[in-house]
């Protein structure tokens, strides 16, 4: 079950809760946002506060890292497992240091098997960062500082750090360096969102977050 | 293919103001940034400033900074940089070059021909 | 701002021959580093970027390597339309900066 099912189920308080997959007894823990545009929405990424190292592996992007009340990334498995048994939209807001924020809802999302690298999938942009989707379309493959599956003769992931769906590499990576107030300027391997904030900008806080469709 | 073409030659006074442009086609202009560089004669390369072609944001070198202004005109694809108060060391050729600025990525290809700025009572 | 220095200056080398430039940086760069030929006379021209990847068009005698502070331009097999000025250049930070160049003839 999805925080959406756990909303349903009346709980509707922010927090962490316990989810699983359907058919499946694996128990992930992710944070549940029961407040913003209806609640039911389960949280994938947040960054924050740079507590968290994001320069990670293949194997750790895949099942997820961090922590569910502060900054982590639930996981590429799930996610895929999660996104291929019904519709979910994606929601990704963010926030800049002068205290403006911003979000991309895409009305249909999904990632692709691990052995399709995760490849993400996303229709129908909306929202206020950017009339571009700062994740290139159509979908890249996901890659991680030890599996380079971009479409640049250089290595993204290790130029610009983290994981993400890089093209060549693209207009946004998420998962950058966090740098704090006053050195978050001119970084080229910061929390970029291109269409929203333009380059060498590095932001202060994302969320992704991602909800069924029909809820 | 991705071209830049820059404006003439130029020939200046001391204390003159000079504005090149830089006409771009073959790409995407908001996906991209400008570097202008110069070469003074005989010489290496000296970077001015940057300017985005989606916001038009800039960042200038210290050495230039309140002299240089870059400019960019989307609905022509085409990049400006203007120096005042000219003096006869800033005689140069002055080129402008793409980036990828969307991928943050500072490498500079392909350039413009260049523009000689003479400088000169 | 970001110092880079190259070596040499200059350098004199027969066709055949592989010509080595390095490029020092002050202060690290990670692999944010390129490398341009310049003829006398045209616009410089992009080589390698992101330190050792080769820009698509470019001779693969040509290569890159090096991260951090120590970075190298091989020539392997130097023709003779390898002549010209080599400048590093890094994409680290702004201000962007050059290497002073080297300058490779023919003998």
């Known amino acids: 079950r999805d925080c959406a099912e756990v909303f349903k189920s009346g709980h509707t308080t922010n927090g962490v809760y316990t989810l699983t997959l359907p058919n499946s007894t694996e128990e992930v823990k992710a944070y549940c946002d029961m407040e913003a545009g209806g609640g039911g929405w389960t949280i994938i990424q947040r960054r924050e506060d740079g507590s968290v190292d994001f320069q990670r592996t293949w194997k750790e992007y895949k099942v997820g890292f961090g922590n569910p009340s502060g900054e982590y990334w639930l996981g590429n498995e799930f996610v895929s497992q999660l996104t291929n048994q019904q519709r979910y939209v994606l929601k990704i807001h963010l926030k800049d240091w002068e205290g403006n924020e911003a979000y991309s809802l895409y009305e249909h999302f999904y990632l692709s098997s691990e052995e399709l690298n995760y490849r993400i999938h996303l229709k129908g942009l909306t929202g206020t960062a950017g009339k571009i989707s700062s994740i290139s379309q159509p979908g890249n493959d996901f890659s991680t500082k030890d599996a380079d599956n971009d479409k640049c003769i250089c290595k993204c992931s290790q130029m610009l750090t983290g994981g993400w769906w890089f093209d060549a590499c693209g207009p946004s990576n998420l998962n950058g360096m966090y740098y704090p107030q006053r050195q978050n300027t001119n970084k080229f391997n910061g929390i970029k969102w291109y269409y929203w904030k333009g380059s060498g900008y590095s932001l202060k806080g994302t969320t992704m977050m991602i909800r069924p469709a029909d809820f | 293919q991705v071209q830049l073409v820059q404006s003439g030659v130029e020939v200046k006074k001391p204390g003159a103001s000079v504005k090149v442009s830089c006409k771009t086609s073959g790409y995407t202009f908001s996906n991209n940034g400008f570097s202008w560089v110069r070469q003074a004669p005989g010489q290496g390369l000296e970077w001015l400033g940057w300017i985005s072609g989606y916001n038009g944001n800039t960042n200038y070198a210290q050495k230039f900074q309140g002299r240089v202004t870059m400019t960019t005109d989307t609905s022509t694809s085409t990049a400006y940089m203007e120096l005042r108060t000219l003096r006869s060391d800033d005689t140069a050729v002055y080129y402008c070059?793409?980036?990828?600025?969307?991928?943050?990525?500072?490498?500079?290809?392909?350039w413009g021909q260049g523009t000689l700025v003479t400088v000169a009572s | 701002d970001i110092q880079m220095t190259q070596s040499p200056s200059s350098v004199s080398a027969s066709v055949g021959d592989r010509v080595i430039i390095t490029c020092r940086a002050s202060?690290?760069?990670?692999?944010?580093l390129a490398w341009y030929q310049q003829k006398p006379g045209t616009a410089p021209k992009l080589l390698i970027h992101?330190?050792?990847s080769l820009q698509t068009g470019v001779p693969s005698r040509f290569s890159g390597s090096g991260s951090g502070t120590e970075f190298a331009l091989t020539i392997n097999s130097l023709q003779p339309e390898d002549f010209g000025t080599y400048y590093c250049?890094?994409?680290?930070?702004?201000?962007?900066?050059f290497g002073g160049g080297t300058r490779v003839e023919i003998k």
């Open positions: 992101s330190a050792s």
């Open positions: 250049q890094q994409a680290n930070s702004f201000p962007l900066t």
């Open positions: 070059a793409r980036d990828q600025d969307y991928s943050n990525f500072h490498w500079l290809d392909p």
């Open positions: 202060q690290g760069l990670s692999s944010w």
